[in-house]
């Protein structure tokens, strides 16, 4: 018996087609992805093949103005329209709190939403009961397939799930659910979840009875043969893991942003054992037409977005200096504003010993593309912020050693004076440079804000200590020459859309007046 698994993950509100780098579509003839194009391909496959499941491994939420405005309603609507069969909860599904998950998505989705390792307690338990499930048995033709979900246990540090959801260890939580499926005579089981490729592989290895793992969170691109676009494969598709009980378990993921549709064909024997598995992600490029009906629906929903872009988010009573003349040479108040917003967006009081889990922010000055003039009645709009942060990036959480941070700050000024983008703006950091010294030895003082303290204060950076830092995904991926960050980071979790982070902060503060205050000397 043959099953076709179509899968997406980390779509991050890319409902419309995008450029090849998943930013805003500029030249339509070269654009990719989007739900209208995805639907065309899914329908093509559904028509051609008998047993097809369309699955999503989480993080549909967060990433573009679509999510900012529609807050998840767009996810439910278009996933219903595409007739998804199941979805796993990702960490970003909790970005607007549990209510922001329940009302727009859990109550509106026609498909089951899954996670076996999230347990509700207290008053939430009855409120959320039945709205998400640990597993679901899906009929496919004359057979049944069990889908069991999982979500990153780091979610409390990455999002806003509140205090009434407990995120258990994935493997510990999955095993009893898989065992239950076995007792129900379900012998074909897919683990669908959002914990990253390393955990996906561990699940394949450790959870007895899981036949296939469909993952997300790490934006992993797997491919067999010559890859069709810019993404470099982390391994073959499917990635085969030998389980502890000797089975070959295919593990798949489909990069991110709806650029690819994962396509995996699995052949099972009559006892539910995987005989063979093969496939590849399908690049959703312009050779695949956008479905006109879904496209028309997208255009209808788009109208509200255009209106939102020009509405006032808040006011500034000072000039927001985002000029390259400032932000690539010295501390600029736009950099301070953005870094303050980045830290504010990551306030998570999960431990009494820590005022917060992260206190530091770094931001490449070259990523700040425009100032905002306060003389327009002080008004700040989404449109204004899109000029400051036009690349559609995210502000991510990483863990770095102090020694890596030191290298990053040396790189920040290694060719100072040439108006290059690598000059770092900061938050929760005091850095002193001596530009008379030779490149690689210009950082003379580097103090960082403590986290394990009740009164935050600045202490000297310790080379061997591990620090959490918020930074643009561009830097986490080694952009602007920050190869040391990419090479030496100990953990990387993708965060919220850059503009959304700043706009939320401005809306919260209502009136802002960021200063230049001696963070960089």
């Amino acid at each position: 018996w043959e099953l076709t698994i179509l899968h997406t993950n980390d779509v991050h509100s890319r409902l419309e087609q995008t450029s090849e780098d998943s930013s805003k579509c500029v030249n339509a003839s070269r654009c990719m992805g989007g739900v209208a194009r995805l639907f065309t391909k899914v329908q093509q496959i559904r028509r051609a093949e008998p047993n097809v499941l369309l699955l999503d491994a989480g993080d549909q939420y967060q990433g573009t103005i679509w999510f900012t405005v529609y807050k998840g309603a767009e996810v439910a609507h278009f996933m219903n329209a595409l007739r998804y069969d199941a979805m796993a909860l990702g960490n970003h599904e909790f970005d607007n709190g549990v209510e922001g998950l329940i009302e727009p998505l859990l109550k509106e989705a026609k498909f089951p939403i899954l996670s076996a390792n999230i347990k509700a307690k207290g008053p939430l338990a009855s409120q959320i009961s039945g709205l998400y499930l640990p597993y679901k048995v899906l009929p496919v033709g004359d057979e049944v397939v069990g889908i069991v979900g999982y979500t990153s246990k780091e979610t409390p540090f990455l999002s806003n799930p509140g205090t009434n959801l407990v995120f258990e260890d994935e493997i510990t939580a999955l095993q009893p659910e898989v065992d239950k499926l076995k007792t129900l005579n379900v012998n074909k089981i897919i683990a669908l979840g959002h914990s990253g490729f390393e955990m996906d592989k561990l699940i394949a290895q450790k959870v007895r009875g899981v036949d296939v793992v469909v993952g997300g969170h790490s934006n992993t691109f797997l491919y067999t043969g010559n890859p069709p676009s810019k993404e470099v494969p982390a391994g073959k598709y499917p990635f085969i893991v030998t389980s502890d009980d000797g089975r070959k378990v295919p593990v798949v993921q489909a990069y991110a942003f709806g650029k690819y549709l994962g396509y995996l064909k699995i052949e099972f024997d009559e006892r539910g054992n995987v005989i063979s598995s093969h496939g590849n992600p399908i690049l959703l490029n312009s050779s695949i037409p956008e479905d006109p009906s879904i496209k028309a629906d997208i255009n209808k929903w788009r109208i509200k977005l255009d209106n939102y872009s020009t509405q006032e988010l808040g006011k500034t009573i000072v000039y927001l200096d985002g000029s390259s003349q400032s932000c690539r040479f010295r501390e600029c108040n736009m950099g301070n504003l953005i870094c303050d917003a980045m830290i504010n967006n990551n306030l998570r009081h999960t431990d009494e010993m820590f005022w917060n889990h992260v206190s530091m922010c770094i931001l490449n000055g070259g990523g700040i593309r425009s100032p905002i003039d306060e003389r327009n009645n002080g008004t700040i709009t989404w449109e204004n912020l899109a000029a400051v942060l036009p690349f559609g990036g995210t502000f991510d959480l990483v863990q770095l050693k102090g020694s890596t941070l030191k290298k990053a700050f040396e790189h920040s000024v290694h060719r100072y004076g040439q108006s290059t983008g690598e000059f770092l703006q900061v938050g929760g950091i005091h850095v002193v440079y001596d530009l008379s010294r030779k490149p690689g030895d210009r950082v003379v003082k580097l103090d960082v804000l403590c986290t394990k303290c009740r009164v935050p204060s600045y202490d000297p950076l310790k080379m061997d200590e591990v620090y959490k830092v918020i930074l643009p995904n561009f830097l986490a991926n080694g952009g602007d020459g920050f190869q040391m960050i990419k090479d030496e980071l100990l953990r990387h979790d993708s965060g919220d859309q850059d503009i959304n982070v700043v706009s939320t902060y401005i809306s919260k503060m209502k009136v802002i007046y960021p200063a230049v205050e001696g963070r960089i000397k």
Epitope: F39, Q43, R46, R47, A81, R83, D85, K110, F111, L138, P139, V140, G141, D142, E143, V144, D291, S293, I294, A296, D297
Partner: antibody, heavy 121, light 107 residues
Framework: QVQLVESGGGVVQPGRSLRLSCASS????????MHWVRQAPGKGLEWVAV????????YYPDSVKGRFTISRDNSKNTLYLQMNSLRAEDTAVYYC??????????????WGQGTMVTVSS | DIQMTQSPSSLSASVGDRVTITCRAS??????LAWYQQKPEKAPKSLIY???SLQSGVPSRFSGSGSGTDFTLTISSLQPEDFATYYC?????????FGGGTKVEIK
Amino acid sequence: QVQLVESGGGVVQPGRSLRLSCASSGFTFSNYGMHWVRQAPGKGLEWVAVILYDGSNKYYPDSVKGRFTISRDNSKNTLYLQMNSLRAEDTAVYYCARGGSSWYPDSFDIWGQGTMVTVSS
Amino acid sequence: DIQMTQSPSSLSASVGDRVTITCRASQGISSWLAWYQQKPEKAPKSLIYAASSLQSGVPSRFSGSGSGTDFTLTISSLQPEDFATYYCQQYNSYPLTFGGGTKVEIK
């Protein structure tokens, strides 16, 4: 082979009740949504009810809502339609039809031969 | 509710003719449309689903097209066994609704 066979039709007085059955064979009944569709003499097709594969949801058009109840017994591979408060306009051939394997609305790939229900005094 | 309007309600054609039947939905239904053939005193038979997919065992002279609100069933070369009534049906949302039917008669 895949087959649906309806039974239980007949002549009934207005206001009375009737229960139709549909026996299935040749496929995994519990995996499919099942529907009733009717056709009044000389008229077109009208959808009457659906029950999802696991019995979790049922849907009806306004014309029969509150009067007709669809049910299924997966252990017997049988679909039912309980029709109460019957009216003259319910006179039709009633077909049972197989839908899809999910909770989304679907088309019908297999049809029974139909059973005639006549509501008349 | 979504109304389905079929046209024409009847047509006369000869064996070998190309026949086109249209179906219009009162609102967008994407490609969630099916076509059925019904002969007198018989149950309907599924021809096409998802607007353009041929049900297995259905001759290739039948084809469907369309998306959104406007759909077409085409019989490329009418055969004697094709004289029947044809219905479209939307399954975008409940309640499921059928077109009024198109009767294809011998000229």
